[in-house]
Interface confidence: medium
């Protein structure tokens, strides 16, 4: 297993929608075909797996039906966005990638992405 | 089809800790926030708490802080509703019900609801 | 903290007849959190509308929901014998406060 370094903002906002997106760069030391971007969060020292895709090099990331992700690469880019988050999701947002192929095996973890959710007052009469 | 499964009947003392379990298929457990209701004999419905299965993350009403615990667990679909020094006021149905969600976006409402877990707190 | 009062308690009625439910909330509340379920006895409640006047999947076009503000209505058209149930109404104002009213039976007469 070799380091690589991964690169993602220290703090983003989410919107009032509860949808926040940040960019995860990583600087990849050879010509990757396949890549595994996984974000966790980190709150009250613990890990937890939000969400991981799979992708080859120029297709679009491929999250799980139904997943609270969703993003899109652009070579050593990865676009992520979390939609549904409310104020008790509010944490630090690692971004976690993995070069699968070809060998050899590269890992790299963010710092993280501090995530504040505020939970909006509802609006008389607003809309979803 | 989505289905919520809790688990049984119980019957605790005064002072006791009752953990109830509620398992969740027919969708992607952790992209729907699950909430915990309770409803004593012939009352009404009461909001307890949330959870969110993706981070684990919880809120709870401020009735029950500090005596209400919500986890999860991911690799077998599973929401669990813990709550402590029982007494006999919280005599009830306890349901799990997940949250309405549409294009992403969470609705606070809840679509799906189990037949629900009867607790009974008595000495 | 909003407060959700319904009225009438009871309300009975034949069915072919035309039910009208009211919820009342203490402030103002966004129709946009705003919804109605149905619990038959030893059963979970039922989504019937949200929004306030969006319909729930499977829902029949009987059921219908309207209001704004601080006044809400459920309206059913003609009462179907399966219809005669108690009725809440719920709304959201943050992470911690998802409160409901106290219900409504609907009754046969």
């Known amino acids: 297993c070799k380091a690589m370094h991964v690169a993602q903002p220290a703090v983003v906002l989410a919107s009032s929608r509860g949808i926040a997106s940040f960019v995860c760069e990583y600087a990849s030391p050879g010509k990757a075909t396949e890549v595994r971007v996984t974000v966790l969060r980190q709150a009250d020292s613990q890990v937890t797996e939000v969400c991981a895709a799979t992708y080859m090099m120029g297709n679009e990331l491929t999250f799980l039906d139904d997943s609270i992700c969703t993003g899109t690469s652009s070579g050593n880019q990865v676009n992520l966005t979390i939609q549904g988050l409310r104020a008790m999701d509010t944490g630090l947002y690692i971004c976690k990638v993995e070069l699968m192929y070809p060998p050899p095996y590269y890992l790299g973890i963010g710092n993280g992405t501090q995530i504040y959710v505020i939970d909006p007052e509802p609006c008389p009469d607003s809309d979803f | 089809q989505v289905q919520l499964v809790q688990s049984g009947a119980e019957v605790k003392k005064p002072g006791a800790s009752v953990k109830v379990s509620c398992k969740a298929s027919g969708y992607t457990f952790t992209s729907y926030y699950m909430h915990w209701v309770r409803q004593a004999p012939g009352q009404g419905l009461e909001w307890m708490g949330i959870i969110n299965p993706s981070v684990g993350s919880t809120s709870y009403a401020q009735k029950f802080q500090g005596r209400v615990t919500m986890t999860r667990d991911t690799s077998t679909s599973t929401v669990y509703m813990e709550l402590s020094s029982l007494r006999s006021e919280d005599t009830a149905v306890y349901y799990c019900?997940?949250?309405?969600?549409?294009?992403?976006?969470?609705?606070?409402?809840?679509?799906?609801w189990d037949q629900g877990t009867l607790v009974t707190v008595s000495s | 903290e909003i407060v959700l009062t319904q009225s009438p308690g009871t309300l009975s009625l034949s069915p072919g007849e035309r039910a009208t439910l009211s919820c009342r909330a203490s402030q103002s509340v966004s129709s946009s959190y705003l919804a109605w379920y149905q619990q038959k006895p030893g059963q979970a409640p039922r989504l019937l509308i949200y929004?306030?006047?969006s319909r729930a999947t499977g829902i029949p076009d009987r059921f219908s929901g309207s209001g704004s503000g601080t006044d809400f209505t459920l309206t059913i058209s003609r009462l179907e014998p399966e219809d005669f149930a108690v009725y809440y109404c719920?709304?959201?104002?943050?992470?911690?406060?998802?409160?409901f009213g106290q219900g409504t039976k609907l009754e046969i007469k």
């Open positions: 019900a997940r949250e309405v969600r549409v294009r992403g976006v969470i609705i606070p409402f809840f679509d799906y």
């Open positions: 719920q709304q959201y104002g943050s992470s911690t406060m998802y409160t």
């Open positions: 929004g306030a006047s």
